[in-house]
């Protein structure tokens, strides 16, 4: 950021999207602001319009190409600028030299489905979305299960320290409604963070067989 009252944070989804959030202390006048992306070794540049997400925070997505196209590599540096209109001119509000593979946040896992469910266990699978082939198997996952009467925040985290796109949940209660979420993170990148949580998958365990304990 240009100064201490401004915070400009961006993440690369590893394929063709850079998502940015810019926050500024002290409300700006009703003005138009954009993020401009200028790669150091690519012929393209890209712009997105910052839209308010709160009173002092704006966000936008730089769409660099088709969702699964590999637009940047670990050697790229992208100059990202926040530009706001004042009068007829543009004023730079924040700038950063962005290293995409040091600032990764993947898309949330998708296609969650129950592979097999029993009274006390459930096998669930998912897929990762728009993740670079560069990672090979260097990914980790966190999962959580929402039990009746609890909140997501209370749910214990299960860690999968490898690229494993399934989980077998054990010690579940028969005939009970649960929800399940998973998120993913590459091992690469100093400022890399977890993806958003997936959409919750609801499932119900099978009832216990009658006449059995």
């Amino acid at each position: 950021a240009v100064n201490g009252t401004s915070r400009f944070t961006c993440f690369y989804n590893s394929r063709a999207n850079i998502s940015c959030v810019w926050s500024q202390d002290g409300a700006l006048q009703d003005t138009s602001c954009q993020v401009h992306a200028w790669p150091d070794r690519r012929r393209w540049n890209q712009t997105c319009e910052l839209l308010p997400v709160s009173q002092a925070s704006w966000a936008c997505n730089l769409i660099l190409g088709t969702p699964d196209s590999q637009k940047l590599t670990a050697v790229d540096i992208v100059t990202l600028r926040v530009m706001c209109r004042e009068g007829v001119r543009w004023r730079m509000m924040a700038i950063q030299d962005f290293k995409p593979f040091e600032n990764l946040r993947l898309m949330a896992p998708i296609s969650l489905q129950v592979v097999h469910v029993e009274t006390h266990r459930c096998n669930i699978s998912w897929k990762i979305s728009q993740a670079s082939h560069y990672f090979e198997r260097h990914l980790e996952f966190e999962a959580r299960t929402l039990s009746p009467g609890h909140t997501w925040e209370e749910a214990p985290l299960m860690t999968l320290k490898q690229k494993q796109e399934w989980i077998c949940l054990e010690t579940l209660t028969p005939d009970t409604q649960y929800e399940f979420q998973v998120r993913v993170k590459p091992l690469q990148g100093e400022f890399t963070t977890w993806s958003p949580w997936s959409q919750p998958l609801a499932f119900r365990t099978k009832p216990a067989a009658l006449g059995k304990d």
Epitope: V2, N3, M83, G87, V88, R91
Partner: antibody
Framework: EVQLVQSGAEVKKPGASVKVSCKAS????????ISWVRQATGQGLEWMGE????????YYNEMFKGRVTMTRDTSISTAYMELSSLRSEDTAVYYC??????????????WGQGTTVTVSS | DVVMTQSPLSLPVTLGQPASISCRSS???????????LEWYLQRPGQSPRLLIY???NRFSGVPDRFSGSGSGTDFTLKISRVEAEDVGVYYC?????????FGGGTKVEIK
């Protein structure tokens, strides 16, 4: 060499309008802003507003809103400033000046020679 | 609007001697991006203004190093280390941080 050449002196009656031109050369006209600044006789400088020739977008100082109109003709790299409902206090030298489209460093780097507008009955 | 007040109004100087002009703004002119867009322009007799200093202390290309700018917040100064004959004219400070942008009233530098 960057040059801004303005139209000649004008004498106008109160209530009339005046249109001052500013012809740019030595740079890409549509890449920079043209600001207009006036200087009443023996007085200081007053920023009136500006136009971006690239898209014709304008911004006017509140003080002149409703009376000033800034336009451009990109085919001849010329910017215009029209001031209406003239009164004696509008007697001044009117300057055009070039400015960067992104205000990273300074507002105005090159100036026209000025156009004297006299408002007298 | 931000009012820019310059002092003195007139400054008689001796060739080869230093000169100093003050400019005060009615409010802080640090822009929300952290920069201070304080500029100095010189208008020689019968000429158009020309840019000398931008962002408080940066000399524009071709401006001699005897000109220097300093200050912060609301108080700014233009110094000429050794005045030369070509430095005669009216000096204006200008703020480009808050629209509408405004000029100071000017300081007339003349040789004693």
């Amino acid at each position: 060499e960057v040059q801004l050449v303005q139209s000649g002196a004008e004498v106008k009656k109160p209530g009339a309008s005046v249109k001052v031109s500013c012809k740019a050369s030595g740079y890409t006209f549509t890449d920079y802003v043209i600001s207009w600044v006036r200087q009443a006789t023996g007085q200081g400088l007053e920023w009136m507003g500006e136009i971006y020739p690239g898209d014709g977008n304008t911004y006017y100082n509140e003080m002149f809103k409703g009376r000033v109109t800034m336009t451009r003709d990109t085919s001849i790299s010329t910017a215009y400033m029209e001031l209406s409902s003239l009164r004696s206090e509008d007697t001044a030298v009117y300057y055009c000046a070039r400015g960067s489209y992104t205000y990273d460093n300074y507002a105005m780097d090159f100036w026209g020679q000025g156009t004297t507008v006299t408002v007298s009955s | 609007d931000v009012v820019m007040t310059q002092s003195p109004l007139s400054l008689p100087v001796t060739l080869g001697q230093p000169a100093s002009i003050s400019c005060r703004s009615s409010q802080n002119i640090v822009h929300s991006n952290g920069n201070t867009y304080l500029e100095w322009y010189l208008q020689r007799p019968g000429q158009s203004p020309r840019l000398l200093i931008y962002k408080v202390s940066n000399r524009f290309s071709g401006v001699p190093d005897r000109f220097s700018g300093s200050g912060s917040g609301t108080d700014f100064t233009l110094k000429i280390s050794r005045v030369e004959a070509e430095d005669v004219g009216v000096y204006y400070c200008f703020q480009g941080s808050h629209i509408p942008w405004t000029f100071g009233g000017g300081t007339k530098v003349e040789i004693k």
